[in-house]
């Protein structure tokens, strides 16, 4: 039966009507409107934008639109005492100072309240000392420094280039290495694509451009002062010393012109290999300290930022479902930006706005979705996914019982080459089927499907003729829904060609130059890629909310579970002797995966054959599909990461942005050869295999016939 029959509506109100209502020109108009002034979390400007969106969503036709506010810990520079870094001579005189602000882009010279570049949640401090260059400050970079090069970072200020991993992991690694300060900078090797001009003449990062960002290690906690619970009016708040995830050493970001001044004087050890060299005209010496003539000079940081409990506002819109109003499909993206938010987040917020408008238009014509759709404009994402996490903490009981799916809607573009999708395996078939029905916006693929251009440009490494779909990691607002609550989640955006553009993210990410003009002039003048992303995100929401049988295929989970089990087994098998010595076996895990595969197959057969006109049986089957993702949640969470509770996926312990499969086992095996107590270490591996095997088996049993 078609999804229309469930809600007894006229045939014209189907997916096609919804998609046809989406217009590129509207997305363009909304993006312009959202990017004219900064919308930093906790500011009056962002509160006003929340109220504007609330008002417009009501006009678009949603049943209700409410503001949900929380009082969370945020971080701001001191307006009268700016942050900067100096080179000081032996007399303590400052002979060089880093820039105090980015030169504003043309047309924005008179805009007030542009927050200068800073590392949010850096403690205050004025450390001085010798510099050590630590490449990307990844786990492996510190291994190279400490183990191979015998360079001690203790008591040093480290300078690391942005890219490859989440900046919070860089800071954590530096802290663990004993550093007393961290300088983060954008190297042209990572943020300047060859053959492209810097902004405003192109989309590359100018030398004075700086990436802002938080440096927390929250591990899914939300507000650092109220982990696990909403930061509401009667919240009990931890003291700052007990706050979750705050860095303990000063951190500050700079651009590559300023970095050049610090790096050109570096002495000490030469870089270990070419992977430690960027594109600046400097030797990329590791240090410690400056060379010959400059050996008496030191680096001094001046950081005066403050942490403040501040009110934030989510906008929550509801479109009530006609048949299953107690089943929620959520479309959410953040509203707060570091400055203008031309790409992050407003290219996503503009798409959400147009999706809401299209759904509202259908509703005004008498249509309703089968299930309830919730729309969210999250606040304070840039400060640690705070708005989404606090709302989910407040509504966790409802969400865990009623949450069907969460679709994330941050930046719609990070390039204009092809589609990029990260999602639960349950959504693979939904994404494939949807993209086969959408037109590709790509040059050279006129009249072809999005699926075709996507598959050609970004092929799956495992399955020929299929596109790449990646694991969910974190660093965005789906985190609490997927990693903590076990709600099936997905995200989609247009991306760059990773083969030819090896820089990290997009060059102007979190800089003052992320403007409307950046998008309109250089990334998507016709807004055709934005429209395609709107169709993908909106189409997923439409199907999830309106299809009679949930568009989840549990067999795809079976396939990836086998792949992940094979992968973790091969990692463990790098230590065959220890596996034998400590009787480490993966038999239980492979057995559970086999059982899951068989049960999922049988469930899928039943799904084809059952009587869809029987609402009780339909609801029962749909509940088994809805609760499958939930079944992968371990209520005890992962070791030392209680809010990462998904046993199959978690953000990598070494890079929050990346997803890791069987993370409990992976972390237990990581660097196991260096553990002081191998018996204990391998015991933990065995325990994690047990947890994973049990969880997979338990999840499989939720798909078995109920009686």
């Amino acid at each position: 039966k078609s999804s229309n029959e469930a809600t007894n509506i006229t045939p014209k109100h189907n997916m096609k009507a919804f998609l046809d209502e989406l217009k590129a020109e509207n997305i363009k108009k909304f993006l312009y409107n959202f990017t004219q002034i900064p919308h930093l979390a906790g500011t009056e400007q962002n509160f006003q934008l929340a109220k504007q969106i609330q008002s417009q969503w009501k006009e678009f036709g949603l049943d209700s639109v409410e503001l949900a506010h929380y009082d969370v810990l945020l971080s701001y520079p001191n307006k009268t005492h700016p942050n900067y870094i100096s080179i000081i001579n032996e007399d303590g005189n400052e002979i060089f100072n880093t820039s105090l602000f980015e030169p504003p882009p043309p047309g924005y010279e008179n805009v007030s309240d542009i927050v200068p570049p800073f590392s949010a949640f850096s403690p205050q401090g004025m450390p001085e000392g010798d510099l050590v260059y630590v490449n990307y400050a990844r786990t492996e970079d510190f291994f190279k420094l400490e183990r191979d090069m015998k360079i001690n970072c203790s008591g040093k200020i480290v300078i690391a280039r942005y890219g490859k991993v989440f900046r919070g992991n860089k800071v954590k690694n530096a802290q663990l290495a004993g550093a007393k300060g961290v300088i983060l900078y954008s190297d042209p090797a990572d943020y300047f694509a060859p053959g492209v001009k810097s902004y405003p003449d192109g989309w590359n990062l100018p030398g004075g451009g700086v990436q802002r960002g938080n440096i927390l290690n929250l591990n899914g906690a939300g507000d650092p002062l109220t982990p696990g619970y909403p930061a509401n009016e009667y919240a009990y708040r931890r003291g700052i010393a007990e706050a979750v995830g705050l860095p303990s050493i000063p951190v500050h970001p700079i651009g590559y012109y300023d970095a050049q001044k610090l790096l050109e004087k570096m002495g000490g050890s030469a870089p270990p290999d070419s992977s430690w060299r960027g594109s600046l005209k400097v030797p990329y010496n590791v240090g410690p300290g400056f060379t010959g003539n400059f050996s008496t000079q030191k680096v001094k940081m001046h950081i005066h930022s403050t942490n403040e409990v501040t009110r934030i506002y989510n906008v929550i819109g509801t479109l009530r479902g006609a048949v299953e109003p107690d089943r929620y499909v959520i479309l959410g993206g953040h509203r707060d930006s570091w400055v203008f938010g031309g790409i992050d987040p407003q290219s996503g917020a503009a798409v959400v706005h147009e999706i809401v408008r299209s759904f509202g238009t259908l509703k005004k014509e008498g249509w309703r979705p089968r299930r309830t759709i919730l729309f969210a404009s999250w606040d304070a994402e840039e400060f640690g996914l705070l708005g989404s996490t606090e709302w989910a903490e407040e509504n966790s009981r409802l969400l865990q019982e009623r949450g069907v799916a969460y679709i994330n809607a941050d930046s719609s573009i990070e390039g204009n080459y092809t589609l990029r999708v990260d999602c639960t395996p349950l959504m693979y078939s939904l994404v494939h089927n949807l993209t086969k029905e959408l037109k590709s916006p790509d040059e050279g693929f006129e009249g072809k499907s999005l699926y075709e251009s996507w598959t050609k440009k970004s092929p799956s490494p495992e399955f020929s003729g299929m596109p790449r779909i990646s694991k969910l990691g974190s660093g965005n607002d789906f985190e609490v829904f997927f990693q903590r609550l076990g709600i099936a989640s997905g995200r989609a955006r247009y991306t760059k060609n990773w083969e030819t553009n090896k820089f990290s993210g997009y060059p102007l990410y979190h800089s003052v130059y992320e403007t409307y003009e950046l998008v309109e002039k250089f990334y998507d003048p016709m807004f055709k890629y934005h429209l395609t992303v709107a169709q993908v995100r909106g189409g997923m929401v439409f199907e999830l909310a309106n299809s009679i049988v949930l568009p989840f295929d549990c067999r795809d989970y079976a396939v990836v579970l086998r792949k992940y089990a094979d992968k973790i087994y091969s990692i463990s098998m790098k230590h065959p002797q220890e596996m034998k010595t400590y009787s480490v076996s993966f038999d239980s895990l492979f057995s559970a995966v086999k059982n899951f595969t068989e049960i999922a197959s049988k469930f899928s057969e039943r799904l084809q054959d059952f009587d869809k006109s029987n609402p009780i049986v339909l609801r029962m089957m749909n509940d088994q599909l809805m609760f499958l993702e939930r079944a992968f949640i371990d209520p005890l969470g992962l070791p030392d990461r209680p809010f990462y509770r998904h046993v199959i996926y978690a953000p990598s312990s070494h890079n929050k942005y990346a997803g890791e499969s069987f993370p409990g086992i992976y972390d237990a095996l990581f660097d196991i050869e260096s553990k002081v107590d191998p018996s204990k270490a391998w015991g933990e591996v065995k325990r994690q295999i047990y947890v994973a095997a049990f969880t997979v088996q338990a999840a499989a049993e939720t798909l078995s016939e109920v009686a």
Epitope: Y84, I95, F96, N97, T98, S99, L100, F101, E102, P103, P104, P106, E109, S198, P206, G207, G208, G209, G255, Y257, K261, E264, K265, K281, P283, N293, F294
Partner: antibody, heavy 122, light 108 residues
Amino acid sequence: EVQLVESGGGVVQPGRSLRLSCAASGFTFSSYGMNWVRQAPGKGLEWVAVTSYDESNKYYADSVKGRFTISRDISKNTLYLQMSSLRAEDTAVYYCARDPYSSSWNGAFDIWGPGTMVTVSS
Amino acid sequence: SYELTQPPSVSVAPGQTARITCGGNNIGSKSVHWYQQKPGQAPVLVVYDDSDRPSGIPERFSGSNSGNTATLTISRVEAGDEADYYCQVWDSSTDHVVFGGGTKLTVL
């Protein structure tokens, strides 16, 4: 049109002071590093001073350090060179020049003014 | 302090290639910029960052830089190229701009 125009030159006695101005137009003055360069009659180019776009860094040639001060007024789009304790060897055409990269102040000089002549003579 | 050495003069026939050198200790590790100055006029940037050309400068002007020598090359020299040419670097050890002494290019 992007341009720089110097003014304030003239004849001045040794030991006295003079302030040169450089009016900028056609670009976002507050985003660029700015320099003063001089050229004595029949001689080569000699750099005098630089200020970064946000004035967080100012550097001077050894020959003028402690006597000359570079500054800028963003509201007036003007660069200044305050010269004191002038000497005969300061006689030169003084040019103001812009760094070609927004936010840089130690690169090349892509825009030059026509220059203003300063003569230090008793 | 850092010093840049240029030949005082270079002569070349029209249509030929002129090469003006700029010597400095390990100059290859620095970014070199070149200026053309005609009598009574302000200098004009012709090459920056070793080898990049500003818009409006003919392709005949090119630069290279390695080791202890940077070179400005003017191919198919024209009479209008006759001028003084200066090389320039930033000396990070003193935080000073340094100019070469200049080279007078004569077109025969």
